[in-house]
Amino acid sequence: LNTTVLQGMAGQSLRVSCTYDALKHWGRRKAWCRQLGEEGPCQRVVSTHGVWLLAFLKKRNGSTVIADDTLAGTVTITLKNLQAGDAGLYQCQSLRGREAEVLQKVLVEVLEDPLDDQDAGDLWVPEESSSFEGAQVEHSTSRNQETSFPPTS
């Protein structure tokens, strides 16, 4: 399964779009979860509206917002006020009963605001990339190739 690498600036918003087959996933709720380890569980952050027909309505948990365009087959997750602690590996999921199908794996990287002199601590700033672009990363390509996914405010 592809891994999408997305970079966002601390304090700004990062929008993640996961596309899927609208017919195959008809009637299924979507979720955004954080993968906590190699084989560990994917911890649910937020999921779409309990009533599938209302999935277009924005659902929020803290600073994370999810909304699903079920006709277009696109679920959009917005991470607002991005913080260093938001960096990590996430999944877009399609829910079917108790089972969850992974639609996309998303690696979120948080870039430190160069004007902020505070200690970055656990913040990881990739040396080879100064732009805020993300890249569609197949298991055969590296960062900063292919399609760009600029973060939005």
Partner: antibody, heavy 122, light 105 residues
């Protein structure tokens, strides 16, 4: 800066004991799993021990080659990670590396120390 | 879970494409790669199968799934001469491959 610094290596006789230390800085140490990896002279890398974070009950894991002889522990208040080596054998002679991997937000990003040398010889 | 790297030793000329493989005896979620040069500690090189670690040149790439993984250098440079190790963090014991030593022709 994220950093791991090992210490405590040295020359020890067979059947002897030694305690290695790893000082961590620049990251939220208490949220990460920590590991020891060693490399015998001219040989490849061998993972030997792991301790998980408090939220994972400080679970420990060992390679068969060191089980019941080596013990790893941690002190989250001091950002320290340890490896107690006992009943040492000549084949334990190696460079010992402290490695961060697992449990934290960036569980997939490894951080390695520069290593400390252990020589087991009579 | 045994990781087998091949070849154990390989040489390449500057500009040449290089591919080394890592085969796992049972399926793993991700593969990790490290670069090590003489008298230096290993450097994380590729994580989560295909993501380049900070500072790694874009000529490197990683790929694979299940039991078969590879590291590729699109155009060999002198500074790439080193030993490369693969590792799986999926299952205890967290095994390493035996390494592929890459030398410059």
């Amino acid at each position: 800066e994220v950093q791991l610094v090992e210490s405590g290596g040295g020359l020890v006789q067979p059947k002897g004991s030694l305690k290695l230390s790893c000082a961590a800085s620049g990251f939220s140490f208490n949220t990460y799993a920590m590991n020891w990896v060693r490399q015998a002279p001219g040989k490849g890398l061998e993972w030997i021990a792991r301790i998980r974070s408090k939220s994972n009950n400080y679970a420990t894991y060992y390679a068969d080659s060191v089980k019941d002889r080596f013990t790893c522990s941690r002190d989250d208040s001091e950002n320290m990670f340890y490896l107690q080596l006992s009943s040492l054998k000549t084949e334990d002679t190696a460079m010992y590396y402290c490695v961060r991997h697992g449990d934290g937000n960036l569980w997939y990003i490894d951080v390695w120390g520069t290593g400390t040398t252990v020589t087991v010889s009579s | 879970n045994v990781l087998t790297q091949s070849p154990a030793l390989m040489s390449a000329s500057p500009g040449e494409k290089v591919t080394m493989t890592c085969s796992a005896s049972s399926s793993v979620s991700y593969m990790y790669w490290y670069q090590q040069k003489p008298r230096s500690s290993p450097k994380p090189w590729i994580y989560l199968t295909s993501i380049l670690a900070s500072g790694v040149p874009a000529r490197f790439s990683g790929s694979g799934s299940g039991t078969s993984y590879s590291l590729t250098i699109s155009s060999m440079e002198a500074e790439d001469a080193a030993t490369y190790y693969c590792q799986q963090w999926s299952f205890n014991p967290y095994t390493f491959g035996g390494g592929t030593k890459l030398v410059i022709k």
